[in-house]
């Protein structure tokens, strides 16, 4: 079962490293892949002293924790580097750090929902 | 520290049912996939089910398909597996596993044995 | 149906190396199916040796490596040692929600 799927034609290209890997440092990038696989897009980012540095934008492989993201929030606390992905055209145009801890379960007994 | 720890396993008749669960800690539940992987006694590893980070899809192999449901709870930190008209040949141990980007199993339960017999 | 083979088993010699295979019945085995590869002891859950094709899981020793040989994914073991006596299992990850596991391969390390 899937809902509410959007597909992934085009997003975002972004390289800082572009002289070096010889790429365009910045575009829009079609995504090409199997016809029976997801596509996606992603942002790779670093937050230096405060100042957000773009490392990567482009499009992802079907990844299933992609999935059902429409937009591209970090959500992992305090990485080394930030990564997002998302589905959706262009989803990867704006990116987000929106840590999430850990949800530590109620230390009373709670009733068990049914299935 | 990553822990996956599963419980529900057990004894069950053919056409029966049981409900599978799995509780994650150690790591932010809610931001990762998750899947079912099982083994039948003196056979390989055989993937059951995964599931999406909000649970909006789901998916299933072929031969349980209609007969399980995954689900999952984000805040509990729990992930299920539902099984009705359960088959001998569904008799295993169920791993639940956490997936990770470019989806692959980082972590794995222990395993809890579902025997269906009559 | 999507069928993954593996040898069924392999024999090494302590300190040798030995490459298992990965392939499927549907055509090469790419980057794309992020090809992993886990480790089983019997009675004992998997653990995570390999991932997307060549990455090495977090404190497995650098004698285990992946890689793409030909048209399969490969998981080299150089240096094999007494306690690599195991089962491996490789995994594609098909996309769309499906991962498909090969059906193992049982490691015996003579002597």
């Known amino acids: 079962a899937i809902l509410g799927r959007s597909e992934t034609q085009e997003c975002l290209f972004f390289n800082a490293n572009w002289e070096k890997d010889r790429t365009n440092q910045t575009g829009v990038e079609p995504c090409y892949g199997d016809k029976d696989k997801r596509r996606h897009c992603f942002a790779t980012w670093k937050n230096i002293s405060g100042s957000i540095e773009i490392v990567k934008q482009g499009c992802w492989l079907d990844d299933i924790n992609c999935y059902d993201r429409t937009d591209c929030v970090e959500k992992k606390d305090s990485p080394e580097v930030y990564f997002c992905c998302c589905e959706g055209n262009m989803c990867n145009e704006k990116f987000s750090y929106f840590p999430q801890m850990e949800v530590t379960q109620p230390t009373s007994n709670p009733v068990t929902p049914k299935p | 520290e990553v822990q996956l720890l599963e419980s529900g396993g057990g004894l069950v008749q053919p056409g029966g049912s049981l409900r599978l669960s799995c509780a994650a800690s150690?790591?932010?539940?809610?931001?990762?996939?998750m899947a079912w992987v099982r083994q039948a006694p003196g056979k390989g590893l055989e993937w059951v089910s995964g599931?999406?980070?909000?649970?909006?899809?789901?998916f299933y192999t072929d031969s349980v398909k209609g007969r399980f449901t995954v689900s999952r709870d984000n805040s509990r930190n729990t992930l299920y597996l539902q099984m009705n008209s359960l088959r001998a040949e569904d008799t295993a141990v169920y791993y639940c596993?956490?997936?990770?980007?470019?989806?692959?199993?980082?972590?794995w339960g222990q395993g809890t044995l579902v025997t269906v017999s009559s | 149906q999507t069928v993954v083979t593996q040898e069924p088993s392999f024999s090494v010699s302590p300190g040798g190396t030995v490459t298992l295979t990965c392939g499927f019945n549907?055509?090469?085995?790419?980057?794309?199916?992020?090809p992993s590869w886990y480790q089983q002891t019997p009675g004992q859950a998997p653990r995570t040796l390999i991932y997307?094709?060549?990455t090495r899981s977090s404190g497995v020793p650098d004698r285990f490596s992946g890689s793409i040989l030909g048209n399969k994914a490969a998981l080299t073991i150089t240096g094999a040692q007494a306690d690599d006596e195991s089962d491996y299992y490789c995994?594609?990850?098909?996309?769309?929600?499906?991962?498909?596991f090969g059906g193992g391969t049982k490691l015996t390390v003579l002597g």
């Open positions: 596993a956490k997936v990770y980007y470019t989806s692959f199993f980082d972590y």
């Open positions: 150690g790591f932010t539940f809610r931001n990762y996939a």
């Open positions: 549907s055509g090469s085995v790419s980057t794309s199916y992020y």
């Open positions: 997307n094709t060549n």
């Open positions: 995994v594609l990850w098909m996309g769309s929600g499906i991962w498909v």
């Open positions: 599931i999406s980070v909000t649970g909006g899809s789901t």
